[in-house]
């Protein structure tokens, strides 16, 4: 059966075998700035190109043991959520991965900046179709990281980021607080904001919308056919990156403002239980859960 | 995310170091009345002191960025400090990434073309 998260973003009356929206995002390239990935995993093989970009800090601790499957875990799962053969949102999208997070999932603002600059230079050297950049990471508020995101967005790139897993105001984090970035919070199968240990999804006016982010089945780096369930606002952001890829594939010239309106228009509204959020944040937090437009194979009909 | 909001800094720390006119050896003085600012992460454990992103004013060319970085190195050396330029930015933002002592921040903020300087900090998988 179809995983709950794909069912949630796919409007009612889809059958599992029918989930095949228009060309699956094939005109769009999605850049993933994350950990290293297992590019030969069956879910993403041939769909993800590993760039030679790497800018990561040393792992903490003298006894840290670099294990490939652990190093690749986060990025592989997200690549699968965006474009995986079986459990992906935009099954036709092609991806490029940049390594900005180390084996402990840690990176730097400067490394992320250099990664964003790499994407911009690639775009200038070889202009392709629409670009989506997925930033499944968060740090403290950073003026420079937000500024770089703004510049890239103004160059026509769609940036999607995780709201953060700190059960806090997303405006205190970057790139979540950058106005030009689509910032995504996480909800679960019950349309509740996701709790992660003692923390959970961020919230507030810097969040644009929510998406499935708990118990998300995706590619596991433990083996080339393994699957694993992961949770977080990164997973939520990956869903929106996939939806954006599909919308842009259908309408490649959409501006960021237009795409944002599409995402809002097709979202499920007022389904999130707002009691989870601090009282002063409820009115500021958008009650929107991302969804795909509800038709599959559709060319505009013309009488 | 969420367009249309004011760009608030929240509890983001901004340390404004006023420019002092007695700085020696500047071929180009900064524009009158402008104050370059220093920023660092409000979450202390995430700070990475010793590495700084020097962001230059919007229209600064790559050659000017390189010249500004070299000037910083020369002035730091004159004071007995080692610095290392790790990356020169161009394409998105003009500027450079430098490894240096925090003692040099005041000096760096007085360099021509400098808009602001941000201390590097950590980001994490979510």
């Amino acid at each position: 059966s179809i995983p709950w998260n794909l069912e949630r973003i796919t409007p009612p009356r889809y059958r599992a075998d029918e989930y095949q929206p228009p060309d699956g995002g094939s005109l769009v390239e999605v850049y993933l700035l994350d950990t290293s990935i297992q590019s030969d995993h069956r879910e993403i093989e041939g769909r993800v190109m590993v760039t030679d970009f790497e800018n990561v800090p040393e792992e903490d601790g003298t006894r840290f043991h670099r294990q490939a499957s652990k190093c690749d875990s986060h990025g592989t799962h997200l690549a699968g959520v965006v474009s995986g053969r079986d459990a992906g949102v935009a099954k036709g999208a092609s991806m490029r991965s940049l390594r900005v997070l180390n084996c402990q999932g840690k990176g730097t603002v400067s490394g992320t900046l250099i990664g964003l600059e790499f994407i911009r230079k690639s775009q200038l050297v070889q202009p392709v179709g629409p670009l989506v950049v997925l930033l499944p990471l968060a740090g403290g508020y950073s003026r420079v990281l937000n500024a770089a995101c703004q510049r890239l967005a103004r160059a026509g790139v769609v940036l999607v980021t995780a709201a953060g897993n700190f059960r806090d105001d997303a405006c205190l984090y970057s790139p979540a607080s950058a106005p030009e970035v689509i910032t995504v919070g996480a909800t679960n199968a019950q349309d509740q904001p996701v709790t992660l240990g003692t923390l959970g999804t961020n919230f507030g006016r810097c969040v644009d919308l929510f998406a499935p982010g708990e118990d998300i089945i995706g590619a596991s780096s433990d083996c080339s056919t393994c699957f694993v369930s992961q949770s977080g606002t990164s997973q939520a952001a990956a869903h929106v990156a996939g939806i954006a890829a599909m919308m842009l594939s259908a309408e490649p010239e959409l501006t960021l403002a237009e795409l944002r309106q599409r995402l809002i228009h097709f979202s499920a509204k007022d389904v999130i239980n707002e009691a989870w959020f601090p009282e002063d944040q409820r009115v500021l937090t958008p009650n929107l859960v991302a969804a795909l437009p509800p038709s599959t194979h559709e060319n505009l009909y013309f009488q | 995310g969420a367009m249309g909001q004011e760009d608030e800094d929240g509890d983001y720390e901004e340390l404004v170091l006023a420019l002092r006119s007695e700085e020696d050896g500047l071929a180009e003085a900064p524009e009158h009345g402008t104050t370059a600012t220093f920023h660092r992460c409000a979450k202390d454990p995430w700070r990475l002191p010793g590495t700084y992103v020097v962001v230059l004013k919007e229209e600064t060319h790559l050659s000017q960025s390189e010249r500004t970085a070299r000037r910083l190195q020369a002035q730091a050396a004159r004071r007995g400090y080692l610095t290392k330029i790790l990356h020169v930015f161009h394409g998105l933002l003009p500027g450079f990434l430098v490894k240096m002592s925090g003692d040099l921040l005041e000096l760096a903020l007085k360099l021509p073309h400098v808009d602001y300087i941000e201390e590097d900090s950590s980001v994490f998988a979510q």
Partner: antibody, heavy 119, light 109 residues
Framework: EVQLVESGGGLVQPGGSLRLSCAAS????????MSWVRQAPGKGLEWVAN????????YYVDSVKGRFTISRDNAKNSLYLQMNSLRAEDTAVYYC????????????WGHGTMVTVSS | QSVLTQPPSASGPPGQRVTISCSGS????????VNWYQQLPGTAPKLLIY???RRPSGVPDRFSGSKSGTSASLAISGLQSEDEADYYC??????????FGGGTKLTVL
């Protein structure tokens, strides 16, 4: 063939009510936002209301809020517009239109049904 | 009074090119795509251009659309007598309404 057919128009007195229907065929009705658009005699097009594919969201132009109600029955492939407290200025041809999902436009229109509000 | 502003009329001889403008605001054209509809006399409107500049199948490439900021325009080249119709621009508005232009009556001279 993809088709929308409106019915239920007619002559009604000011303050009266009328219920318009739109029968959809040739496509999966339950997957589309649907709209009502009207055109007063000799005038331009004016959007009246729309409804989400599952009926969970409804929006109206200010001039009909509180008087008109849009609804749908996906099992019957039908769209409805209940019009109460009708006024002379509601006189128009009412079109049922499908909103395309991947182009965000009215890509299928019915032939229209005439509503005349007059004493 | 329509939310989007169009000239009430436009005209041109056969074979010529004519352009129809449509002006809106940041809440409609500025943040959403523009569509154009053609309404031949006595018939229902039909979609001519969607997503600013895309043509549904069956629409001749003589029709083209563009958008810049809060304005859009429809261009018809190689004007033909069967192009004589009313043309309407439309866009979704952030206030959760579809908005139309007042319509432009095109006359082929």
């Amino acid at each position: 063939e993809v088709q929308l057919v409106e019915s239920g128009g007619g002559l009604v007195q000011p303050g009266g009510s009328l219920r318009l229907s739109c029968a959809a065929s040739g496509f999966t009705f339950s997957r589309y936002w649907m709209s009502w658009v009207r055109q007063a005699p000799g005038k331009g097009l004016e959007w009246v209301a729309n409804i989400k594919h599952d009926g969970s969201e409804k929006y109206y132009v200010d001039s009909v809020k509180g008087r008109f109600t849009i609804s749908r029955d996906n099992a019957k492939n039908s769209l409805y517009l209940q019009m109460n407290s009708l006024r002379a200025e509601d006189t128009a041809v009412y079109y049922c239109a499908r909103e395309s999902n991947w182009g965000f436009a009215f890509d299928v229109w019915g032939h229209g049904t005439m509503v005349t509000v007059s004493s | 009074q329509s939310v989007l502003t169009q000239p009430p009329s436009a005209s041109g001889p056969p074979g010529q090119r004519v352009t129809i403008s449509c002006s809106g605001s940041s809440s409609n054209i500025g943040s959403n795509t523009v569509n154009w509809y053609q309404q031949l006399p006595g018939t229902a409107p039909k979609l001519l251009i969607y997503s600013n500049n895309r043509r549904p199948s069956g629409v001749p490439d003589r029709f083209s659309g563009s958008k810049s900021g809060t304005s859009a325009s429809l261009a018809i080249s190689g004007l033909q007598s069967e192009d004589e119709a009313d043309y309407y621009c439309a866009a979704w508005d952030d206030s959760l309404n579809w908005v139309f232009g007042g319509g432009t009556k095109l006359t082929v001279l």
